[in-house]
């Protein structure tokens, strides 16, 4: 006896279409684009029913249910808005991701996603993955007038990238993105195999304040060209934090230098070093201090460190020097790893040009200069580490 004529479910069709279906005849159901076969709540790859000898089909008719992409994933440091309608997540629905204003900017795409037939929220560029809210770098409450000031107390928001590193000694670093710290290799060398021993603090001006944002290190990456106790060439390291920090006016990453950044770091251009290192009184500073210092001609700096007790070749092409010939303005012990920053007048963002590395035994000594790791030489190294890990 024939089986009942199969009625196609809404948004589906039967194939093949026959006048009647007898024993061993079969039909399949195909859904329109944007609809999927469901048996109950379970998706089916395909559906074929066979007519049995008792005149019944061997399987119940499935439904062609509209594809549902489901609630979109939360966007870290951002939000999502339903454009089509509140909570609408079905085929062709549109949502719009956006990043928290001021401190984050959207990377990858424009944040507009459509629910496609494959069940994925998909951007106009075809990406299935979430956009990225990347922290805006180089924002500071401070503006520079190009004058040289010395030993000033920092104000809230002046150096929001400043990181205090407590390990074996007091050192500094600068926040990159929201989960990396750029510092000097010599400052964290002892902790390279014990990253968790590093106590990392940010968002505070006072070195001893109990009010700070705590971060912990997941891994320490020291430049492979750095040799401890054999000079300071390649004195650069990256610390990966085990969690992203929340960006605000007191915690903001520093920018890495653009290719064009060298034009803002010529001899006599002013850079700013900040830290809690030794002051003229010989003690670690309680309050974050900063000093504006000019870049020194490389040959002049090399010559200054050619005489004993410094070994020949102490100053390499991977270093830059800053300070006054008359002395008095310098970084010092405890400032190690901190950023020497410059204002990119085109982007109006601060970027890290140098990392506090080494200098004369007596900080601020006349005729001697602070020596900083030249960050622009290490952009490929930094980018490789960050992209790989």
């Amino acid at each position: 006896q024939p089986c009942p004529y199969p009625m196609a479910p809404p948004n589906g069709h039967v194939s093949p279409v026959q006048a009647k279906y007898i024993l061993k005849d079969s039909f399949s159901i195909f859904c329109e684009t944007g609809y999927e076969l469901l048996q109950g709540h379970l998706p089916l790859k395909s559906f074929t029913a066979v007519c049995q000898k008792d005149g019944s089909w061997d399987r119940p008719m499935p439904a062609c249910s509209i594809v549902d992409c489901g609630p979109p994933d939360d966007l870290p440091s951002g939000r999502v808005e339903y454009i089509t309608g509140p909570g609408v997540t079905t085929y062709k629905a549109v949502i719009q991701y956006s990043c928290e204003e001021t401190f984050y900017t959207m990377k990858v795409n424009d944040g507009k996603y459509v629910c496609e037939a494959d069940g994925f929220w998909t951007s106009s560029k075809g990406e299935k993955s979430l956009p990225v809210c990347e922290p805006v770098c180089g924002l500071s409450a401070r503006t520079t007038g190009g004058q040289i000031y010395g030993g000033q107390k920092a104000k809230p928001g002046d150096f929001p990238w400043q990181v205090l590193i407590l390990g074996g000694t007091t050192a500094a670093g600068a926040l990159l993105y929201d989960n990396w710290v750029l510092t000097a290799a010599h400052a964290v060398y002892e902790q390279k195999h014990d990253a968790s021993a590093l106590d990392i603090r940010m968002g505070t001006l006072k070195r001893l304040s109990p009010h700070y944002t705590q971060a912990w290190s997941e891994a320490v990456f020291i430049h492979e060209g750095y040799t401890h106790d054999a000079g300071f060439d390649n004195d650069i390291a990256l610390i990966k934090l085990n969690n992203k920090v929340v960006i605000n006016s007191n915690i903001t990453p520093i920018c890495l230098p653009r290719k064009e950044a060298e034009s803002f770091m010529r001899t006599d251009d002013i850079g700013t070093a900040s830290g809690w290192g030794l002051t003229q009184r010989g003690f670690l500073a309680r309050n974050l201090m900063y000093v504006d210092i000019p870049i020194v001609d490389h040959q002049k700096c090399t010559a200054a460190y050619e005489k004993p007790p410094y070994p020949r070749g102490s100053v390499t092409a991977n270093m830059l020097c800053a300070g006054l010939e008359s002395g008095g303005k310098d970084s010092c012990r405890g400032d190690s790893g901190g950023a020497l920053v410059f204002l990119d007048s085109e982007t109006e963002r601060w970027f890290v040009g140098g990392i506090v590395s080494w200098g004369s035994m007596n900080c601020g000594e006349a005729g001697q200069y602070g020596v900083y790791t030249k960050v622009i030489n290490y952009i490929p190294w930094i980018e490789n580490i960050i992209s790989d890990f």
Epitope: L38, Q39, G40, H41, L42, P43, L44, K45, S46, D68, G70, P71, T89, G119
Partner: antibody
Framework: QVQLQESGPGLVKPSETLSLTCTVS??????????WGWIRQPPGKGLEWIGS???????YYNPSLKSRVTISVDTSKNQFSLKLSSVTAADTAVYYC??????????WGQGTMVTVSS | SYELMQPPSMSVSPGQTASITCSGD??????AYWYQQKPGQSPVLVIY???KRPSGIPERFSGSNSGNTATLTISGTQAMDEADYYC?????????FGGGTKLTVLG
């Protein structure tokens, strides 16, 4: 993001009924997009699906357990529950609840260990 | 009742490709799902509907399913991928899990 948390007694006597509750936070159990499931894992062994429920009360059960299993839902508390009757030592396992979206379990609760022993 | 079979264990060197198989009668006709479970943790969905990857799952995880075999492939295997992997499918509205494969990353 949605989170699930299992709760209930860690020790049940043989022949008694095992009762567990899963509390859903960060999302509504009444969402039309989801079923909610129970899966268990005996110590050192693999996973076994027990059953799934929709917010309306519609259920699917594993045929091998169907005679002993009841899954229910309380939308007002954003919870769903498992009852397994006539338990034996073979029912000793970590019991997980999970969101069941069109057949895929994601995410899962942290699991709760239930020991059947007198 | 429907059964899914997996090799109990397999090992792979870091950076190499691991292919974990799951076999069942006409498995290719239905969707396969894969879960990763690390010691002491809950399972995590890594592949659904044969080859779809949930957000947050690295691109090195991929899946395929045809004939009687579904395969989870991990390319450029990392130490963090060491775990138990379970395949799962729905047969006649019944959820079925494979017995699991313990993946060891050498070194």
């Amino acid at each position: 993001q949605v989170q699930l948390q299992e709760s209930g007694p860690g020790l049940v006597k043989p022949s008694e009924t095992l009762s567990l509750t899963c509390t859903v936070s960060g999302g509504s159990i009444s969402s039309s997009s989801y079923y909610w499931g129970w899966i268990r894992q005996p110590p050192g062994k693999g996973l076994e699906w027990i059953g799934s429920i929709y917010y309306s009360g519609s259920t699917y059960y594993n045929p091998s357990l169907k005679s002993r299993v009841t899954i229910s839902v309380d939308t007002s508390k954003n919870q769903f529950s498992l009852k397994l009757s006539s338990v034996t030592a073979a029912d000793t396992a970590v019991y997980y609840c999970a969101r069941d979206r069109r057949g895929r379990f994601d995410p899962w609760g942290q699991g709760t260990m239930v020991t059947v022993s007198s | 009742s429907y059964e899914l079979m997996q090799p109990p264990s397999m090992s792979v060197s870091p950076g190499q490709t691991a292919s974990i198989t799951c076999s069942g009668d006409k498995l290719g006709d239905i969707y396969a799902y894969w879960y990763q479970q690390k010691p002491g943790q809950s399972p995590v969905l890594v592949i659904y509907q044969d080859n779809k990857r949930p957000s947050g799952i690295p691109e090195r995880f991929s899946g395929s399913n045809s004939g009687n075999t579904a395969t989870l492939t991990i390319s450029g295997t990392q130490a963090m991928d060491e775990a138990d992997y379970y395949c799962q499918a729905w047969e006649s509205s019944t959820g079925v899990f494979g017995g699991g494969t313990k993946l060891t990353v050498l070194g």
